[in-house]
């Protein structure tokens, strides 16, 4: 029997301080270039080494960014989203959605090393 793959979705508020070279990440997505089928949301595609996001450590590649400084990123063109980040100021508050893959064992079976229970 194969194990099933579940996803644990969590949200987090991440406050970044813009570094000398910026915030230090790349994004994909937007209404004009959907990254996920039927989802025009904005996703993190790259965390730059030694950039502000990497040094903070919480933002991860694959995270969905829901808002920037309280401004919703729904239904934005890709370039408009880029511009929003660029003009976000020195202190930048990101509301992000992490999607963690959870590998479960076969239903009804608990592995020997399983700490639960």
């Amino acid at each position: 029997m194969n194990g099933r793959v579940d996803y644990l979705v969590t949200e987090e508020e991440i406050n970044l301080t813009r570094g000398p070279s910026g915030l230090g990440f790349n994004i994909v997505g937007g209404t004009d270039q959907q990254y996920v089928s039927n989802d025009s949301g904005i996703y993190v595609s790259r965390i730059k080494e030694n950039g502000a996001a990497a040094l903070d450590g919480r933002l991860q590649e694959g995270d969905k960014i829901l808002s920037v400084n309280g401004q919703d990123l729904k239904n934005l063109l890709h370039q408009d989203a880029v511009d929003l980040f660029r003009n976000a100021g020195y202190a930048v508050s990101l509301r992000v959605q992490h999607r963690l893959q959870v590998q479960n064992g076969p239903i009804g079976h608990r592995g020997e090393g399983d700490p639960s229970g």
Epitope: S21, G22, N26, I27, V28, S45, R46, K48, H78, V82
Partner: nanobody, 127 residues
Framework: QVQLVESGGGLVQAGASLRLSCAAS????????MAWFRQAPGKEREFVAE????????WYSDSVKGRFTISRDNAKNTVYLQMNNLKPEDTAVYYC?????????????????????WGQGTQVTVS
């Protein structure tokens, strides 16, 4: 390894136009972000314009917005900088630069530290 060769510089009067060209060889041109930087005498090299074909984005520095236009011809492996209404303060050595695009668009201003390939530069003098 990408090689970049600039051309088209020269001496012009204020208000005139020039078109710079940068021919690239040695890489898959369409997968590189291309940019122009410039360095005036006694000053640091500064960003002028960037074109990233794969991410459909074009950016300009505030000092050239509305006067300069960056464009590229992937079939010819060439990037251009059309400079109109030139001013004496545009006098500088103009450098073409390239870096391999990563997935997505950087949310940061173009930064020359990201560019790993540079041309030798072409002199533009506006009198």
């Amino acid at each position: 390894q990408v090689q970049l060769v600039e051309s088209g510089g020269g001496l012009v009067q204020a208000g005139a136009s020039l078109r710079l060209s940068c021919a690239a060889s040695g890489g898959t041109f369409s997968s590189y972000a291309m940019a122009w930087f410039r360095q005036a005498p006694g000053k640091e090299r500064e960003f002028v314009a960037e074109d990233s074909w794969s991410n459909h984005r074009v950016w300009y520095s505030d000092s050239v917005k509305g006067r300069f236009t960056i464009s590229r011809d992937n079939a010819k492996n060439t990037v251009y900088l059309q400079m109109n209404n030139l001013k004496p303060e545009d006098t500088a050595v103009y450098y073409c630069a390239a870096y391999r695009d990563y997935s997505g668009s950087t949310v940061d201003p173009p930064n020359q530290s990201e560019y790993n390939y540079w041309g030798q530069g072409t002199q533009v003098t506006v009198s």
